[in-house]
């Protein structure tokens, strides 16, 4: 079961981080979340410039993800189809993360409910039944050179590449690979 | 068919109220951002208001903040605009926008409704 | 605020000429976020183009559009009767979310 995450990495404001979003799920091919130029969302089987995104929290647990290259915002209908956006709509484009034991994410949209997964082969009426949450693995993403796309919510924090801006985690502390710089 | 259509435009004195309405259908209304948007009457364009997919959020120019007041009602997919201490340079046709989900254009238009602010 | 700046306001065109209309923004813009759309007299806007070089759908392919930074245009091939109207380019800025106009290209048939 989801459990909601408690880090104190969540309750500093702003916190950045760039991730590949994997899922390998068994209705899935193993695939990395993309935000595309045309501002579609799909999966793509190796990692690519659409598929680096930046994850930010808004809040404690709740996050916005942008792909680093479109600059555009992942965001979900009430139906659960997904799209990328310039415009980041908080009521569209926030996800609450839930961290999974076994150190996969689950992302579920913070207005609807629903949970985050990438779009499959065939048409989500075709589904023959509802799925579960997706899980997603996230992959530490190379700090890029690239200035920080626009129009993000709030300055960036200092430290952002520590995955411990406020040192509050010790060495010893087992750690989400979401956090692994 | 999607369609907008805006109702409630009047003649109305400086310093008064006036709350319009644009009723939407032919399309999940609860989907997407929302916006009005006037024409003056030397056929200038300015956006007036917009709200988020959910109506938590709104946004305004300046030249109307404080003045008007922008809402929805997912249930009824309607849009509204309450606008008070309405001035002569609020006269204008004023239409109901939506906004497309990726690149937040505005992507359909209602066919306008005209307020008039004269004493 | 970044103010948009359309050129010429009127211009007259004969059937079949090139035309080429400017907006001019104060300071940059993304091209992913300049748009254009055309209004007829006793109708309203449409969009025409979308992220500086995209037609929406229904638009001839003698309309292009094109620019970057502060420097936007649409042009028309060769100027037919249907495309005499108004074209208004159209900027949305991210943070905060704010949505310019320019003042509009009138084009008319010569």
């Known amino acids: 079961h989801p459990i909601p995450d408690s880090s104190p990495l969540l309750q500093f404001g702003g916190q950045v981080r760039q991730r590949y979003l994997y899922t390998d799920d068994a209705q899935q091919t193993e695939a990395h979340l993309e935000i595309r130029e045309d501002g579609t969302v799909g999966g793509a089987a190796d990692q690519s410039p659409e598929s680096l995104l930046q994850l930010k929290a808004l809040k404690p647990g709740v996050i916005q993800i942008l792909g680093v290259k479109t600059s555009r915002f992942l965001c979900q209908r009430p139906d659960g189809a997904l799209y990328g956006s310039l415009h980041f709509d908080p009521e569209a484009c926030s996800f609450r993360e839930l961290l999974l034991e076994d150190g996969y994410n689950v992302y579920q949209s913070e207005a609807h409910g629903l949970p985050l997964h990438l779009p499959g082969n065939k048409s989500p009426h075709r589904d023959p039944a509802p799925r579960g949450p997706a899980r997603f693995l996230p992959l530490p993403g190379l700090p890029p050179a690239l200035p920080e796309p626009p129009g993000i919510l709030a300055p960036q924090p200092p430290d952002v590449g520590s995955s411990d801006p406020l040192s509050m985690v010790g060495p010893s502390q087992g750690r989400s690979p979401s956090y692994a710089s | 068919e999607v369609k907008l259509v805006e109702s409630g435009g009047d003649l109305v004195k400086p310093g008064g109220s006036l709350k319009l309405s644009c009723a939407a259908s032919?399309?999940?209304?609860?989907?997407?951002?929302m916006s009005w948007v006037r024409q003056t009457p030397d056929k200038r364009l300015e956006w007036v208001a917009t709200i988020s997919t959910g109506g938590g959020y709104t946004y305004y120019p300046d030249s109307v903040k404080g003045r008007f007041t922008i809402s929805r009602d997912n249930a009824k997919n309607t849009l509204y605009l309450q606008m008070s201490s309405l001035r002569s340079e609020d006269t204008a046709m004023y239409y109901c926008?939506?906004?497309?989900?990726?690149?937040?254009?505005?992507?359909?238009w209602g066919t306008g409704t005209t307020v008039t602010v004269s004493s | 605020q970044i103010v948009l700046t359309q050129s010429p306001a009127i211009m007259s065109a004969p059937l079949g000429e090139r035309v080429t209309m400017t907006c001019t923004a104060s300071s940059s813009v993304s091209s992913s976020y300049l748009h254009w759309y055309q209004q007829k007299p006793g109708s309203s806007p449409k969009v025409w183009i979308y992220?500086?070089?995209n037609l929406a759908s229904g638009v001839p392919t003698r309309f292009s559009g094109s620019g970057s930074g502060t420097s936007y245009s649409l042009t028309i091939s060769s100027m037919e009767a249907e495309d005499a109207a108004t074209y208004y380019c159209h900027q949305y800025h991210r943070s905060p979310p704010t949505w310019t106009f320019g003042g509009g290209t009138k084009v008319e048939i010569k």
């Open positions: 992220r500086t070089t």
């Open positions: 032919g399309f999940t209304f609860s989907s997407y951002g």
């Open positions: 926008a939506r906004h497309d989900l990726v690149d937040w254009y505005f992507d359909v």
